[in-house]
Structures are given as structure tokens and as C-alpha cells.
Interface confidence: low
């Protein structure tokens, strides 16, 4: 993400839908584009491009050597270089990148979906648990926030596209192998009832499995790795 934060057309960790909304704001003209953080690929990006009044999305993978490429395409030193190249050469894209859609004044790249997600989960949790609405809901959110944040942080992963619940090892392999075979493609599944997980990662066409254990204090880590309070933090790291 550091390699793109300086770009005026980089929106950070926005969703595909948000990207499309921005492109609509920009007039949806052919070749209008923006860059965002990939939610599926570690260190990757996504390029959203308007063409024929429709948004088209391309995954930009970060290769092991630190270069960036659209699946099957030419490697570039940075996301900016990639966008510059595709402004002169479509090379598999639906059209040339003609005009970057810049962040509106005062808008910073979104640092990650967790903050927004956390707000939404807290709101939903309070709403459903205490059946509140309006001002009473807002007041309850403010008063309960510190306690709720910890609870929400530990379950936030369940809402993430990379968390696949209690699927089998075989199913997890099939899922990362389907579609593009890109380095860094991953998912996490629940292993058993002890609160442990497994990371299923695609690397050079091979599926690698890593155990994510929970220690006595409740912290999560890949064996011999750094410990995290939540699955969310482990993945973000």
C-alpha cells in the first residue's frame, strides 16, 4: 500500500461497489480509472476502469520479486508504472487508461475496512441485542463502545471475504485453485472447535497450508510466528 499512498487516484481499501460509485461520480467516461487496495491478495491492488458505462475490475498482483502485474501481463516496478503503461497500451485491458479519477479534496486513502466494519458491526450488535433505534441506539453505542470493540474485533473476520468458515481442507484447496492462480491468493478456514484456524495460501501454483494456533492467553499465531490478538490483525500484518 505504501507504494501507492502518494497517488492522487489511489483510494485505499475501498470496495468494488465504492469504486464503481466514484467512477459514476466521475462521469463513467471511457478510460476513467482509479486504483484501490486488493481485498483478496496480500500486497496487491485492484484497478477499476470505466468503459461503455460499466466498471471493469482488474487484480494487480505483487510478485515475489516486488514487481506488479495484472494476471498474465507485463511486470512493472510500481502500480504507478503499471497505470502509465496501460495509458499507452491496453495489453489485455478493455480500453486504454485515459483519465485518473482523483480523490476528492480532503479524502484520504482508506486505511483498511476494519474501522468501518467495526462501526457497522457494533451498530448491528447493539441494535439487535437491545432492540434500539435513533438516539437511544447512538447513546448505547457510545457508552458500550470500549467493551464492544474487543468483542467485535475478535469476530470481525467472519464478515471477511477471505474467511470461509468450517470448510474442509480439500474444499479450501479447490477454492484457492479455482480461477486465477496468483501468488498470495489465500483464505482462512476454521479448523476445529478449539478456536484454531488454517491459512490456505497459493504460492507458485502449489497450495500451502499453515496452522494458526491459539495459545493459553488467546493469542493467535502461525507456529514460531508473531502473535496477534485477532485473526484480523494477523491477516492485515
Amino acid at each position: 500500500v505504501d507504494s501507492a499512498n502518494h497517488l492522487t487516484y489511489f483510494f485505499g481499501n475501498i470496495t468494488r461497489e465504492e469504486a464503481e460509485d466514484y467512477l459514476v461520480q466521475g462521469g463513467m467516461t471511457d478510460g476513467l480509472y482509479l486504483l484501490r487496495q486488493s481485498r483478496n491478495y496480500l500486497g496487491g491492488f485492484a484497478l477499476s476502469v470505466a468503459h461503455n458505462r460499466k466498471a471493469h475490475h482488474y487484480t494487480i498482483e505483487r510478485e515475489l520479486n516486488g514487481t506488479y502485474a495484472i494476471s498474465g501481463g507485463r511486470a512493472h516496478a510500481s502500480p504507478a508504472d503499471l497505470c502509465h503503461y496501460h495509458s499507452q497500451e491496453p495489453d489485455g485491458l478493455i480500453c486504454l487508461l485515459k483519465k485518473p479519477f482523483n480523490r476528492p479534496p480532503g479524502v484520504q486513502p482508506k486505511t483498511g475496512p476494519f474501522e468501518d466494519l467495526k462501526e457497522n458491526l457494533i451498530r448491528e450488535y447493539v441494535k439487535q441485542t437491545w432492540n434500539l433505534q435513533g438516539q437511544a441506539l447512538e447513546q448505547a453505542i457510545i457508552s458500550q463502545k470500549p467493551q464492544l470493540e474487543k468483542l467485535i474485533a475478535t469476530t470481525a473476520h467472519e464478515k471477511m471475504p477471505w474467511f470461509h468458515g468450517n470448510i474442509s481442507r480439500d474444499e479450501s484447496e479447490q477454492t484457492v485453485l479455482i480461477g486465477s492462480k496468483t501468488n498470495g491468493k489465500f483464505l482462512i478456514r476454521a479448523r476445529d472447535n478449539s478456536g484454531s484456524y488454517a491459512l490456505c495460501l497459493l504460492h507458485e501454483g502449489k497450495v500451502l497450508h499453515y496452522r494458526i494456533d491459539r495459545d493459553k492467553t488467546g493469542k493467535l499465531s502461525i507456529p514460531e510466528g508473531k502473535k496477534f490478538d485477532t485473526l484480523w490483525q494477523l491477516v492485515e500484518h
Partner: antibody
Framework: QVQLQESGPGLVKPSDTLSLTCAVS?????????WGWIRQPPGKGLEWIGY???????YYNPSLKSRVTISVDKSKNQFSLKLSSVTAADTAVYYC????????WGQGTLVTVSS | QSVLTQPPSASGTPGQRVTISCSGS????????VYWYQQLPGTAPKLLIY???QRPSGVPDRFSGSKSGTSASLAISGLRSEDEADYYC???????????FGGGTKLTVLG
């Protein structure tokens, strides 16, 4: 034990839209990744039509893509197939199946396209 | 014309070992898992082998799968009359971005 049951009209007129539903029992449709449709013309081999992921994203056979829509209804624990602008060539037994590797299959339903 | 190539027919006598081949390319069998299905007359296909050589529970160990390069094969040992069926291989194809099937092999148990 997972069970899949296809349902829908056995006869469809040419140029109409074929609509089938696959009811899933003994398994939550939200728990497994992929749900698919496969067809088999009489006396011929198997042809994959498409997959739907429980979140709603889809993969379709490129040769059928322009005519196919697969959707999922988690509340009813079922998923559906729509195939538009059918011709006699779409006459086949249609199967629904679970998982990328089609681990479980429905018993199939014969759909005949004829006027 | 199927993407994966299987012999249209195969036969054997009870007790014999029969092998069915499935030939593909680097974009399917060469880089992906192979699946085998058995379709008894008038019934839906049933998964026989997944991930090249794994058997689902309930499938007898008389059935085994293997893969080498861009080809795969299904072996049935101790052939029985109830094994008479159509057998299909399948694999994901990277180029087509879809699963592809073989044309099927009709296995006849003689005698």
C-alpha cells in the same frame, strides 16, 4: 447426508427461458463454497454449465455465458438456473451438484425443448 | 469434441483389472486436480476419485486414481458386474477458466 433435488418444467418451448431450482437438504447452502449445474444431452457426455459461490459470485461456461444466470437463495436453502433463448440443442438431463469437484449430485431432471 | 480424451469403451471379465485413461494438456490435467465419476445406467453420476487419487468414503478401494504429467488414469481391480457403467474424468482448465470433462468411457463387464 447431503441431498440435492432438481425441480422445474420438463418441457420448454424454443426461444423461451429454461428455469430450474435445486433444493438442498441435510446441508446449509452457506457452509459450502460451490454449487454447480451440469447437463447431459441424451446419449451424450457431461457438460458443465456454471458454479455459484454461496456469497453470490458466479463462474459460467464461456460457451453458455451470454444465456446463463445462476442465483442462490440462502433463506430457502436452494439455488437456481436460468437459461434463456433455448433451442433443441439444450434438451438434456440437468443436474445440480455440490462442491468444485461435484462431490454430491441431484438425481437429474430431463428438460425437453420442443414446440 | 471433449477437451479431455478418453477411450469410448473398455471391457474386462469379472476379477480382472481394467484401466481407463484420460488425456489432457498442461492447462488442465497438467496443472490441476483430476476427478473421476461413475454413472450407472439411468442414474446420476457419482464421485469416485477426487484430488487425483483420493476416494470419498463409501467408494471401495478396488478403485484407484493416478496422474502423471498431462494424463490420468482410473484403475478398477477385481472387476464386478456392478461396475458396468460410464466413467468420466474431469479437471479445471486454466485457459478456459472452467471445469472440463472427458467424453466418457463405457465399461462392459463380459461373461
Amino acid at each position: 447426508q447431503v441431498q440435492l433435488q432438481e425441480s422445474g418444467p420438463g418441457l420448454v418451448k424454443p426461444s423461451d427461458t429454461l428455469s430450474l431450482t435445486c433444493a438442498v437438504s441435510g446441508y446449509s447452502i452457506s457452509s459450502s463454497n460451490w454449487w454447480g449445474w451440469i447437463r447431459q444431452p441424451p446419449g451424450k457426455g457431461l457438460e458443465w454449465i456454471g458454479y455459484i459461490y454461496h456469497s453470490g459470485s458466479t463462474y459460467y461456461n464461456p460457451s453458455l455465458k451470454s444465456r446463463v444466470t445462476i442465483s442462490v437463495d440462502k433463506s430457502k436453502n436452494q439455488f437456481s438456473l436460468k437459461l434463456s433463448s433455448v433451442t433443441a440443442a439444450d434438451t438434456a438431463v440437468y443436474y445440480c451438484a455440490r462442491n468444485v469437484g461435484f462431490h454430491d449430485w441431484g438425481q437429474g431432471t430431463l428438460v425437453t425443448v420442443s414446440s | 469434441q471433449s477437451v479431455l480424451t478418453q477411450p469410448p469403451s473398455a471391457s474386462g471379465t469379472p476379477g480382472q483389472r481394467v484401466t481407463i485413461s484420460c488425456s489432457g494438456s498442461s492447462s488442465n490435467i497438467g496443472s490441476n486436480y483430476v476427478y473421476w465419476y461413475q454413472q450407472l445406467p439411468g442414474t446420476a453420476p457419482k464421485l469416485l476419485i477426487y484430488r487425483n487419487n483420493q476416494r470419498p468414503s463409501g467408494v471401495p478401494d478396488r478403485f484407484s486414481g493416478s496422474k502423471s504429467g498431462t494424463s490420468a488414469s482410473l484403475a478398477i481391480s477385481g472387476l464386478r458386474s456392478e461396475d458396468e457403467a460410464d466413467y468420466y474424468c474431469a479437471a479445471w482448465d486454466d485457459s478456459l477458466a472452467s471445469p472440463v470433462f472427458g467424453g466418457g468411457t463405457k465399461l462392459t463387464v463380459l461373461g
